[in-house]
């Protein structure tokens, strides 16, 4: 978790002077109480939009937007903290809008944004807003928190920023696998326009089950030049196994950009559809 | 100009099954989350499920836990809502709605619903 690190953070607006401070994610005001404290956050709002740095890459970043109650509590707000917890890691990241000047009651209703977080694709978040000071311990909570989830590489905005095109999200291999005699899979993709090597990886299982049954690797060489994005064809050879009939066929690049962590591509045949009505059985049996 | 068109509303018996389709258009449908609302006959507006730009990601209202399935296709811009195990208090009018930004968020939206169709009634009664 990071900020994005271009132009100076701004919380100020007309009627408020206000300063964005990095947090420890520990306000003094759970140590010390206080006796009056504002109430919670309205209107929690959470989209996911881009930002570009100072060096022109495009990032994927939370966009924060809050308003304030109409009570008399905004005589008590001091600022706010902005937390992003990463729920898989826990790793935490928090700043604080330090108000330099008192509220007051105007004819709009306070908004507050901040679109600074930087977010990681397909990675899920919980984003809280607390307001300052943080309440006594029995007293109300002020604060509003929302579970935001970022989509992945395969979204069609997505693919197009650096952590995504860093791993590969612009490559379309366009897999086609096709079941030969002889039990072989013929796998056929598009090579991307980097001399990097791939990776196929075939995972078997029976009809209706979930493990595999047959499960092999093939390394395919780094292409030529000339070779960019045309097609590789790739004859695998499978066990003969009754009922190992449903495959998936992996891809996974070597990227410089990416090396052993590139988006993979995967493709699957499904088993052969059974005849609805059983084999007939004969009248007769014979008897030699 | 964006559009959503809600169908297969109508009058079941309790314990029966609906499935409600929504059919979007005017905008880029895999891009976004969307929701189903229902508005409740003397009551307000509840949320009832969402789902992900891709359908990877579901959430519910508690009161449809385990009886409503949501679902999309992208290929042919609709959202799906498979409703069984019916009861009375489900009688409401459903609508299918937009997210306004990018982005999925347990327990309702992120943000606004900034596009509402026009509602289909479910009537659920014996």
């Known amino acids: 978790l990071r900020l994005l690190d271009h132009r100076a953070l701004v919380c100020s607006q007309p009627g408020l002077n206000c300063t964005v401070k990095n947090s420890t994610c520990l306000d003094d005001s759970w140590i010390h109480p206080r006796n009056l404290t504002p109430s919670s956050p309205k209107d929690l709002q959470i989209q996911l939009h881009f930002a570009h740095t100072q060096q022109g890459d495009l990032f994927p970043v939370a966009h924060i937007e809050w308003t304030l109650q109409t009570d008399a509590s905004i005589l008590y707000l001091e600022g706010a903290e902005l937390s992003v917890l990463q729920l898989n890691t826990n790793e935490r990241l928090c700043v604080r809008f330090e108000f330099l000047s008192k509220l007051r009651h105007h004819h709009r209703r306070w908004r507050f944004t901040f679109s600074h977080f930087v977010v990681d694709p397909d990675q899920e978040y919980e984003v809280t807003v607390h307001h300052l000071p943080k309440p006594i311990p029995d007293g109300d909570p002020n604060h509003q928190s929302k579970n935001f989830l970022v989509p992945d590489c395969e979204h069609a905005r997505m693919k197009v920023t650096t952590p995504c095109m860093s791993s590969g999200s612009l490559w379309d291999p366009n897999i086609t696998v096709e079941t030969l005699e002889a039990h072989q899979l013929r796998v056929s993709f598009t090579l991307w326009n980097e001399s990097t090597h791939y990776q196929i990886l075939l995972t078997s299982f029976p009809h209706m089950e979930n493990h595999s049954c047959f499960e092999h690797m093939h390394h395919i060489p780094a292409p030529r030049p000339e070779e960019f994005h045309q097609r590789s064809n790739v004859t695998l050879t499978l066990r003969n196994l009754k009922g190992c009939c449903r495959h998936q066929v992996q891809i996974q690049p070597f990227f410089s950009s990416c090396l052993n962590d590139c988006l993979r591509h995967s493709a699957t045949v499904s088993c052969p559809e059974m005849p609805d009505t059983p084999e007939p059985i004969p009248d007769y049996m014979p008897l030699w | 100009e964006v559009q959503l068109v809600e169908s297969g509303g109508g009058l079941v018996q309790p314990g029966g099954s609906l499935r409600l389709s929504c059919a979007a258009s005017?905008?880029?449908?895999?891009?976004?989350?969307m929701h189903w609302v229902r508005r409740v006959p003397g009551k307000g507006l509840e949320w009832v499920s969402g789902i992900s730009w891709n359908g990877g990601s579901l959430d519910y209202a508690d009161s449809v836990k385990a009886r409503f399935i949501i679902s999309r296709d992208n290929a042919k811009d609709s959202l799906y809502l498979q409703m069984n195990s019916l009861r009375a208090e489900d009688t409401a009018l459903y609508y299918c709605?937009?997210?306004?930004?990018?982005?999925?968020?347990?327990?309702?939206?992120?943000?606004?619903?900034?596009?509402w169709g026009q509602g289909t009634l479910v009537t659920v009664s014996s």
């Open positions: 709605v937009k997210e306004e930004g990018l982005g999925f968020c347990r327990g309702g939206s992120c943000s606004t619903f900034d596009f």
């Open positions: 005017g905008f880029t449908f895999d891009d976004y989350a």
